[in-house]
Amino acid sequence: LEVQVPEDPVVALVGTDATLRCSFSPEPGFSLAQLNLIWQLTDTKQLVHSFTEGRDQGSAYANRTALFLDLLAQGNASLRLQRVRVADEGSFTCFVSIRDFGSAAVSLQVAAPYSKPSMTLEPNKDLRPGDTVTITCSSYRGYPEAEVFWQDGQGAPLTGNVTTSQMANEQGLFDVHSVLRVVLGANGTYSCLVRNPVLQQDAHGSITITPQRSPTGAVEVQVPEDPVVALVGTDATLRCSFSPEPGFSLAQLNLIWQLTDTKQLVHSFTEGRDQGSAYANRTALFLDLLAQGNASLRLQRVRVADEGSFTCFVSIRDFGSAAVSLQVAAPYSKPSMTLEPNKDLRPGDTVTITCSSYRGYPEAEVFWQDGQGAPLTGNVTTSQMANEQGLFDVHSVLRVVLGANGTYSCLVRNPVLQQDAHGSVTITGQPMTFPPEA
């Protein structure tokens, strides 16, 4: 017996009624006395509703189900589920037995639209450019869990420093609270979009913040134009300075360092004191120099992952910012050279020479030369693999046909440090073994 149900889930809003469609094709002469119809939960096999022995046996599911009794004889075995709840979500199986037997499962997807988000700002008074604020976007009583997106006033995504929590109430509906921590610019619009992924329904809220500005003009913040190059494992100073006015005191200063791209907080000095490192406890300010306008940041034990742009925000009465780039580097080790085969070599043999250099950053440039300084470009394969720290091991393989004798040298260059590491191997004309025996 062929039983037909919709392929796609039935989407029902919480509190409304849903129809789980199910149909079969009755043969001529069919009567309801022959019909056994059972609806049950697919997973638990819990009985939901049945029609047997020629009559409706009623709902076994919280008295919220009904059949379309006047349509049953035409093969309509659909089930009406009233006042849908989140707990109803799942798969329902429709079993139809006349002389023969068939079944099919239909999915119920429950949904509830999210409310228009309410936006709150903390702190919400006396805001100045450079202040760090917390913007909370709250939307209520939706289902299923929401997707939350933040944007600035130009449509650019704000992904750094967002924390989103979703809590279900007793009915299983979610309240979503998304918190954005952001450093205020001269003015800005921050918008939050809460999407119900099932209903493809968007609810959005936005807040425009216009901090107070003093008439004195922006603070000029100065940073080096060129990237700061720092060796892995050493300490780096990201220089940043401003010109304090006469009578300036540290109580007036808001200094914030953050990652330029993600807006992640790195270090801050506010309310007259050092608020400490928010970046793996590896940053420090030059506190004794702050009052003279030195807002530089010390980054300790530099890692590859630190590479990128850092923004220095300075707010006194007014506000200024500038970004400084950190370029991380690590020197490559002196290359080790291996030869394959390495025994009984003769002119005309094809050999593979491997040049390996370790733990450098960024990726190396590799050059091969013969004994006369001429480049060897054919048949060179270079691979560079990063380890867990992001440092590269470089392996460059040269396939070459031996001449009467020859020197093959490999140069591994660090393009940032302009540091060259080289190794070479000399192969003489008579039969030989590599490395030469003592």
Epitope: E147, Q154, P157, H204, D261
Partner: antibody, heavy 121, light 106 residues
Framework: QVQLQQSAAELARPGASVKMSCKAS????????IHWVKQRPGQGLEWIGY????????DYNQKFKDETTLTADRSSSTAYMQLISLTSEDSAVYYC??????????????WGAGTTVTVSS | QIVLTQSPAILSASPGEKVTMTCRAS?????MNWYQQKPGSSPKPWIY???NLASGVPARFSVSVSGTSHSLTISRVEAEDAATYYC?????????FGAGTKLELK
């Protein structure tokens, strides 16, 4: 009407630099960000980055960050893109486009005609 | 980064036919935009904020969404629809485009 007028085609040698312009008219230049998009011959669209002419803030696709500089001159309502250390991979049409709309829905509503850059020795 | 995968790369259709092209995002996006580009011309805004038709776009164009897949449908293709269609997102950096679907007319 709203327009973005881009500078003429550029022919450059490998290793050289080019600076192209995008002049906005018909709207308030500082109200919208200007984005730059690359299209190599017969290929798709790649986002390079954008500049906010009001704050002069920029954001770059990491892929293009090292060889691209975006600037804007508010007095002439013109955005600029400089490409340095050119290679043959930089031969392409470069479009400027305005990112417009209203919160939270934005899109490129106006595009320049494109500047063709050819890198050849 | 969010990768947008457009399929098919090339779509061939006869005038009057119904066609569908898909743009699948590697993760959820806040909204999707679509652009039409004809050879030798700049891209034109076609559909913005997932399903809104840009000014001058015929009503035969529509978009449906299922999960992270966005499908652009032309109910009855006309000769003027021959072009490459690109999807675009900016829910997270970097802003990305799909590789495009080229609609050719038979």
């Amino acid at each position: 009407q709203v327009q973005l007028q881009q500078s003429a085609a550029e022919l450059a040698r490998p290793g050289a630099s080019v600076k192209m312009s995008c002049k906005a008219s018909g709207y308030s230049f500082t109200s919208y960000t200007i984005h730059w998009v690359k299209q190599r011959p017969g290929q798709g669209l790649e986002w390079i980055g954008y500049i906010n002419p009001n704050s002069r803030n920029t954001d770059y696709n990491q892929k293009f960050k090292d060889e691209t500089t975006l600037t804007a001159d508010r007095s002439s309502s013109t955005a600029y893109m400089q490409l340095i250390s050119l290679t043959s991979e930089d031969s392409a049409v470069y479009y400027c486009a305005r990112y417009s709309g209203s919160t939270p829905y934005w899109y490129f509503d106006v595009w320049g005609a494109g500047t063709t850059v050819t890198v050849s020795s | 980064q969010i990768v947008l995968t457009q399929s098919p790369a090339i779509l061939s259709a006869s005038p009057g036919e119904k066609v569908t092209m898909t743009c699948r995002a590697s993760s959820s996006v806040s909204y999707m935009n679509w652009y039409q580009q004809k050879p030798g011309s700049s891209p034109k805004p076609w559909i913005y904020a997932t399903s809104n038709l840009a000014s001058g776009v015929p009503a035969r164009f529509s978009v449906s969404v299922s999960g992270t897949s966005h499908s652009l449908t032309i109910s009855r293709v006309e000769a003027e629809d021959a072009a490459t269609y690109y999807c675009q997102q900016w829910s997270s950096n970097p802003l990305t485009f799909g590789a495009g679907t080229k609609l050719e007319l038979k």
